[in-house]
């Protein structure tokens, strides 16, 4: 079994998958909004969803951070919480929504002239899965001050979307995060119906681009509630 993986920092007890993958008839492949989906056409709903447990911010979605759900709560019980918007109180950068950072306890905008050059953040991948480089040497990725002066291009390692160049977001790729293209109109998207209601998406998608929202594709309205295809559509 993969219990050892489930007990690692990277994967906790996965919540039910979101409905959303729709196969292409006659094709040997299906497009899936998130990479951890069951076989067949029966998808569980998330009506009885339990909050997604976490040990560190990197386990949560791009618009979430990992913390105890109650003030002064048990530090051992942490879940993915919705990120804090501008002018909200914070204790660290990860608490602030993409495009913002934590300054003097308040989430403020990361404008183009301000780079967190003094911060060096390290992605530590201390999960149960072995991760080795293809050339056989282990690698630890450090995001130094230089990264904040050159916005990450597609495929660059990132911590959050503000690290990526325009048109890209920071999305999970295995147990790292890389800059991927923001979704365009008509592209399949992942609809998280409730904050934090995602499993670990090993191949995570970006969010829909400006002026677009992730909605049920019109011709899929008649499909069963749990297997609807969501695409980026104009507001």
């Amino acid at each position: 079994t993969l219990n050892s993986v489930l007990n690692s920092n990277a994967i906790k007890n996965l919540p039910p998958p979101l409905g959303g993958a729709a196969g292409h008839p006659g094709s040997a492949v299906s497009a899936a909004p998130g990479i951890l989906y069951p076989g067949g056409n029966k998808y569980q709903t998330i009506d009885n969803y339990q909050p997604y447990p976490c040990a560190e911010d990197e386990e949560c979605g791009t618009d979430e951070y990992c913390a105890s759900p109650t003030r002064g709560g048990d530090a051992g019980v942490q879940i993915c919480l919705a990120c804090r918007k501008r002018r909200k109180r914070c204790m660290r950068h990860a608490m602030c929504c993409p495009g913002n950072y934590c300054k003097n306890g308040i989430c403020v905008s990361s404008d183009q002239n301000h780079f967190r050059g003094e911060i060096e953040e390290t992605i530590t991948e201390s999960f149960g899965n072995d991760h080795s480089t293809l050339d056989g040497y282990s690698r630890r990725t450090t995001l130094s001050s230089k990264m904040y002066h050159t916005k990450g291009q597609e495929g660059s390692v990132c911590l959050r979307s503000s690290d990526c160049a325009s048109g890209l977001c920071c999305a999970r790729h295995f147990w790292s995060k890389i800059c991927k293209p923001v979704l365009k109109e008509g592209q399949v998207c992942t609809k998280h119906r409730r904050k934090g209601s995602h499993g670990l998406e090993i191949f995570q998608r970006c969010y829909c681009g400006e002026g677009l929202s992730c909605r049920i594709q019109k011709d899929h309205h008649q499909a069963s509630n749990s297997s609807r295809l969501h695409t980026c559509q104009r507001h």
Epitope: A32, T133, F174, V188, F203, R205
Partner: nanobody, 117 residues
Framework: EVQLVESGGGLVQAGGSLRLSCAAS????????MGWFRPAPGKEREFVAG????????YYADSVKGRFTISGDNAKNTVYLQMNSLKPEDTAVYYC??????????WGQGTQVTVSS
């Protein structure tokens, strides 16, 4: 449209070996990486092994570490899973998946691996 086709599954005795292949065709975009997954009783498809072309890394689940080896050729759009010292609990349909830069994530149809004791 990308199509992923797995092959190499079959029936093998415990302790034996198999080599799975996954070939991607119809790709017009680059791939960030590919992975192998398998279902577990009462659970979603679970991660087995993965290879990231972008990061130059390979990843393994603890349960297969030291027994399975993932390799591949991004230029040939192919990924392999060499499975050694197979155990009955490795019996499953093995699925290949790809993290594509066109924002779609693609699944193959799967190949059955059966390990008899």
């Amino acid at each position: 449209e990308v199509q992923l086709v797995e092959s190499g599954g079959g029936l093998v005795q415990a302790g034996g070996s198999l080599r799975l292949s996954c070939a991607a065709s119809g790709r017009t975009f680059s791939s960030y990486g590919m992975g192998w997954f398998r279902p577990a009783p009462g659970k979603e498809r679970e991660f087995v092994a993965g290879i990231s072309w972008t990061l130059g890394r390979t990843y393994y689940a603890d349960s297969v570490k030291g027994r399975f080896t993932i390799s591949g050729d991004n230029a040939k759009n192919t990924v392999y899973l060499q499975m050694n010292s197979l155990k009955p609990e490795d019996t499953a349909v093995y699925y290949c998946a790809s993290d594509e830069s066109d924002a779609y994530n693609y699944w193959g149809q799967g190949t059955q691996v059966t390990v008899s004791s």
